[in-house]
């Protein structure tokens, strides 16, 4: 629809006034300073500095690998018996004296031989190592047990199996020098002993080896 001619004129005049003032706008007073901006990103790395002075000479170190390879020689011993056939139920069975070269080493010990336990009722027997008469305490005793329960009532007889077995372990905290390593047979706590036999009809051996820690 058409706009009346009077209204058109008024609109043109308004626009001219606005345009005129836009072109002549004076600058006002400075505003309050704005807040600081966020920190900028890191700059590029600087050039390396000049090398520092040499440090003081360090103390002579110990090469572990070198000292181990040069000074650790294998140290082991085997004592063997062709037929111990030892029927004791309590006491020392066999002994082997070993020369331990260092204090800060462990002893690995092994007894291998036939073991037998028999009884009509429940019984238990313990085979264990001693070192100069004392059991290992570094960390715990080296032992093996055989427990035999009573057989069925109708079988009024005892089973008699001799089986080659081993008692083995590591013991720490034993000083350098002569060490008497012995295998003993004894009782288990709270159980009656039976009829034990060690080393029947076969070779028995104690093997002792010194190991670095």
């Amino acid at each position: 629809s058409e706009i009346p001619k009077g209204k058109q004129k008024a609109q043109l005049r308004q626009r001219e006034v606005v345009d005129l003032y836009n072109g002549m706008c004076l600058q006002g007073p400075a505003g309050v300073p704005g807040r600081d901006g966020s920190p900028g990103a890191n700059g590029i790395p600087g050039t390396p500095g000049i090398p520092g002075r040499d440090g003081f000479k360090g103390e002579k170190g110990e090469c572990l690998r070198e000292s181990f390879e040069e000074s650790w020689t294998p140290n082991y011993k085997q004592c063997s018996w062709s037929s111990l056939n030892y029927g004791i139920d309590l006491g020392k069975i066999a002994e082997c004296t070993f020369t331990k070269m260092r204090s800060n080493s462990a002893l690995r010990v092994l007894f291998s031989g036939s073991l037998r336990l028999k009884c009509r009722n429940a019984c238990c027997q313990r085979w264990y190592f001693t070192f100069n008469g004392a059991e290992c305490s570094g960390p715990l005793p080296i032992e093996a047990i055989i427990y035999l329960d009573q057989g069925s009532p109708e079988m009024n007889s005892t089973i008699n199996i001799h089986r080659t077995s081993s008692v083995e372990g590591l013991c720490e905290g034993i000083g350098a020098g002569l060490v008497d390593v012995a295998i003993w047979v004894g009782t288990c706590s709270d159980y009656p002993k039976g009829d034990a036999s060690t080393g029947w009809n076969s070779v028995s051996r104690i093997i002792i080896e010194e190991l670095p820690k």
């Epitope: 002994e95 082997c96 004296t97 070993f98 020369t99 331990k100 070269m101 260092r102 204090s103 800060n104 070192f131 100069n132 008469g133 004392a134 905290g173 034993i174 000083g175 350098a176 020098g177 002569l178 060490v179 008497d180 012995a182």
Partner: antibody
Framework: EVQLVESGGGLVQPGGSLRLSCAAS????????MNWVRQAPGKGLEWVSV????????YYADSVKGRFTISRDNSKNTLYLQMNSLRAEDTAVYYC????????????WGQGTLVTVSS | EIVMTQSPATLSVSPGERATLSCRAS??????LAWYQQKPGQAPRLLIY???TRATGIPARFSGSGSGTEFTLTINSLQSADFAVFFC??????????FGQGTKLEIK
Amino acid sequence: EVQLVESGGGLVQPGGSLRLSCAASGFTFSNCAMNWVRQAPGKGLEWVSVISGSGGGTYYADSVKGRFTISRDNSKNTLYLQMNSLRAEDTAVYYCAKANWNYAYFDFWGQGTLVTVSS
Amino acid sequence: EIVMTQSPATLSVSPGERATLSCRASQRVSSNLAWYQQKPGQAPRLLIYGASTRATGIPARFSGSGSGTEFTLTINSLQSADFAVFFCQQYDIWPMYTFGQGTKLEIK
């Protein structure tokens, strides 16, 4: 109380023999290595020989090897040192010394017995 | 074989004072070192083992320290009964039956 009592020392001619004894009490003798240590007049301590508790192992100082023999009788709690082909330089006070059961330091010593080798 | 060297050979100290004796091993022996005291005409007596542990009946004025190759025996408030010869011995490595040559502690 641990006690070690040596005996058997005396005057002997060069080339002669002597047997020293050491009677032990107050500890489990068979569990301990035993030693002989000697001291020449005005000198320091010189280890002579050691024997394990069981008697299964023995060692000697080079200066006495082949001439001296260490032994023990665990049933009698007694240590022995048989000394043969004695020399003037063997003149010393001989001590019997008990090694600690686990580490080889000497925790008890006898009072010593004097051996003099002279012509 | 490890060689044990003691110093000084002779040490003169007044009663009531402190004495410090040294023992050096030719190689490391951990803490496996013993000290012995020997008075004239008597057998040696164990004073210290494990470098720093006093043997039974040894007074607290005796103390040991050190580890590796350097060891020290210190006697505080010296009494007349303390003057004697002192020996060290390592028992870390076989053969361990070598003693130091001894230090004579005498009254100043």
